[in-house]
Each structure stands twice: as structure tokens, then as C-alpha cells.
Interface confidence: low
């Protein structure tokens, strides 16, 4: 499988574009919208019928260094009585995001874009198959 | 994460922080296939808080196509297949990083941009506000 490339050939290159060595691209990591905040409903991870916990992963050679991953607490879903109903499934919802990876090769440092799959939360679904009779 | 130890003979000029501007390889390293969420999973239909997926396309951005979830109902689907308004379908939102062409239309010059996407929906017990 081919690794996807970011550059698109259909773009007309304006005169104002900065010079970039072949096979590379210039990336400004000063983030646009850095200070925007997520305004999700309060405590949905514990109020959900498919509740989840958060784990923070930390890697100093990645930008951003901190990536938060969700993990479903149960296999089943929580019913109106607060009990787990295993006729339903809690499943993770995932989203791809980009990170910049710093690589050390001898004395030189290089940078690589990387796609990371983040588990954002969980949802309750009707199962497709029950293997147990 | 593990910091890869450098050769002790290297000049000690490395900054622990990332520089503001970096040159990166055009190839994106990933082990995850970039799939249309409609094809990779049918959770959006099977969920008790089902959602529709809307295509958001922007050629000045990478990835140029992002799918946005919109919850179908205010309530959640109960065991009978009806909408139960004692529960709420709410979107799960996530900040993701994308690349924005900067200056515009340049093929190989980008800036990181943080955008907020709704990834899916989940069914929650509502917060009841009692009016005094």
C-alpha cells in the first residue's frame, strides 16, 4: 500500500510560495486556533450509557506531546437501572489526527508527519453477532 | 514515549521544544487506513444515538475531506426502536490537527490548524435543571 502524499499537483504554484527542497514540505507548527476550547456536554463520559475513561499518552518526540485516548469501561451498555446490559455493546468511536514525529538519526534530527488514531469516546450499539448460544 | 538517546559526540545544541517551523517529509507515516467512516463501521446506524455523516471538503486543507457527525435525534432509540426523550443523544467532539496551505494554494507549504469535529454521538442521562 502506498503511503499517502500531502502535496497536490493540481495546485497552481503562486510566485509567493516559499522555496522547498524536493521531497519535503515546510510546516509551521504554530497552531491556528490554538486557544479554542471544546464545549462538550458536561461529564458525558460518565453520563453515557456506554461510559468511558480517559488515558493521557505522553511522548516528548511527538508534537503535540500529549494525546488523550478514551477507553470504554464496559463491554455492554448501562441500562435504566444502572446495570450492565450485555445484549448491547459499548464500542469506541475513533478519529484520525495528525502529529509531527521527531526522529534522531545519528547527530541529525528529522521530522515526519504521522497519522494517529484517537479513540474519542464510546457509543452503545446493537450487536451484529452473538457467538454464545 | 521514549526519547532516543543521541550519540554523545553530537554537539549539544538540541532544543527540547519543537522549532516553530520544520521541514518534513512529504510522505505521511501511518498504520491506519484512511477510510470513509460509512464503510469502515456501521456504528452510526446501529447506535442507540444514531448519527448522519456530512462530508466537509476543503482543498486548502489536508486531509481535504473530513466527515462531520450530526445526531439524528434529541432522544435515544429504545429497545422497541422508538425515540426515548428521557435520554439525550449528544455529539462526541474532538479537536484534531490538520494542515492548512499557507500561503494559500502553495503545494508544499503548510501550517498546523486545530479544528473541532463531531465524531459520533452517544446516549446520556440528561442533566435536569430544576427551576426554583
Amino acid at each position: 500500500r502506498k503511503i499517502p502524499k500531502v502535496g497536490h499537483t493540481f495546485f497552481q504554484k503562486p510566485e509567493s510560495c516559499p522555496p522547498v527542497p524536493g521531497g519535503s514540505m515546510k510546516l509551521d507548527i504554530g497552531i491556528i486556533n490554538e486557544n479554542q476550547r471544546v464545549s462538550m456536554s458536561r461529564n458525558i463520559e460518565s453520563r453515557s450509557t456506554s461510559p468511558w475513561n480517559y488515558t493521557v499518552t505522553w511522548d516528548p518526540n511527538r508534537y503535540p506531546s500529549e494525546v488523550v485516548q478514551a477507553q470504554c469501561r464496559n463491554l455492554g451498555c448501562i441500562n435504566a437501572q444502572g446495570k450492565e446490559d450485555i445484549s448491547m455493546n459499548s464500542v469506541p468511536i475513533q478519529q484520525e489526527t495528525l502529529v509531527v514525529r521527531r526522529k534522531h538519526q545519528g547527530c541529525s534530527v528529522s521530522f515526519q508527519l504521522e497519522k494517529v488514531l484517537v479513540t474519542v469516546g464510546c457509543t452503545c450499539v446493537t450487536p451484529v453477532i452473538h457467538h454464545v448460544q | 514515549g521514549i526519547t532516543i538517546p543521541r550519540n554523545p559526540g553530537c554537539p549539544n545544541s538540541e532544543d527540547k521544544n519543537f522549532p516553530r517551523t520544520v521541514m518534513v517529509n512529504l510522505n505521511i507515516h501511518n498504520r491506519n487506513t484512511n477510510t470513509n467512516p460509512k464503510r469502515s463501521s456501521d456504528y452510526y446506524n446501529r447506535s442507540t444515538s444514531p448519527w448522519n455523516l456530512h462530508r466537509n471538503e476543503d482543498p486548502e486543507r489536508y486531509p481535504s475531506v473530513i466527515w462531520e457527525a450530526k445526531c439524528r435525534h434529541l432522544g435515544c432509540i429504545n429497545a422497541d426502536g422508538n425515540v426515548d426523550y428521557h435520554m439525550n443523544s449528544v455529539p462526541i467532539q474532538q479537536e484534531i490537527l490538520v494542515l492548512r496551505r499557507e500561503p494559500p494554494h502553495c503545494p508544499n507549504s503548510f501550517r498546523l490548524e486545530k479544528i473541532l469535529v463531531s465524531v459520533g454521538c452517544t446516549c446520556v442521562t440528561p442533566i435536569v435543571h430544576h427551576v426554583a
Partner: nanobody, 124 residues
Framework: EVQLVESGGGLVQAGGSQSLSCVAS????????MGWYRQAPGKQRELVAL???????TYGDSVKGRFTISIDNAKNTVILQMNSLEAEDTAVYYC??????????????????WGQGTQVTVSS
């Protein structure tokens, strides 16, 4: 596809200990949750213990403090250590897992899978 194979069931004296093991095999990409449920004759299936790949645990009320669950992510194996067993712990124990896997070239980000079950009998 994904298979879950349980081992370690059998007959044990009340107050004794027993260990159950479950191995997941197949085209596994990641394991989100793995654990155990049990079903006693004439009763509903109930949660025993679950563990996430990150090590977060959930226990059923009746086994808290007596049973311990652990996971070996590298071997796709979950182990249930059962101590201070009681006659009420007699049941068929089912391994359950929520696994992301490849099948026919499609990545399924997570589906629930079940083992065939292993009988644990506690004699008083």
C-alpha cells in the same frame, strides 16, 4: 476472524483458589476490553471482571476483593485469579472481548466476541 479460548476451569473446594486464562487469536489489531462473565444454572449472565488494554478494571459486586483480573497485551491473554471461592461462584465462565480486527480486507474497529465457556464448580 477472532477466536477466544478459555482454560483453567474445573472442580475446586470452597475457600480454595482457581485461575482462568483466555487467549484471543486471529487477525487482531487491538484489544479494547477483555474479561469474564458467568452464568449459573437458571440465572442471568453477570459481569465478573473486565480490564481495558490500559489496565483499567471493573469488577462485579459479588467478586470484589476476592477476584483479580490481569492482562498481557503482548500475548492477547487475560487471566482471572479467583480466591476464597464460594459455592455461589459455581457457573459457566465466559471470556468476552471487544476487539478491533481485520476481516476480508476491512478493518472492524471493535466488535464483541465471546468464548465457548468453561465450567467452574465449587464444592462445599
Amino acid at each position: 476472524e477472532v477466536q477466544l479460548v478459555e482454560s483453567g476451569g474445573g472442580l475446586v473446594q470452597a475457600g480454595g483458589s482457581q485461575s482462568l486464562s483466555c487467549v484471543a487469536s486471529g487477525t487482531i489489531v487491538n484489544i479494547n476490553v477483555m474479561g469474564w462473565y458467568r452464568q449459573a444454572p437458571g440465572k442471568q449472565r453477570e459481569l465478573v471482571a473486565l480490564i481495558t488494554s490500559g489496565g483499567g478494571t471493573t469488577y462485579g459486586d459479588s467478586v470484589k476483593g476476592r477476584f483479580t483480573i490481569s492482562i498481557d497485551n503482548a500475548k492477547n491473554t487475560v487471566i482471572l485469579q479467583m480466591n476464597s471461592l464460594e459455592a455461589e461462584d459455581t457457573a459457566v465462565y465466559y471470556c468476552a472481548a471487544e476487539i478491533g480486527y481485520y476481516s476480508g480486507g476491512t478493518y472492524f474497529s471493535s466488535e464483541a466476541h465471546w468464548g465457548q465457556g468453561t465450567q467452574v464448580t465449587v464444592s462445599s
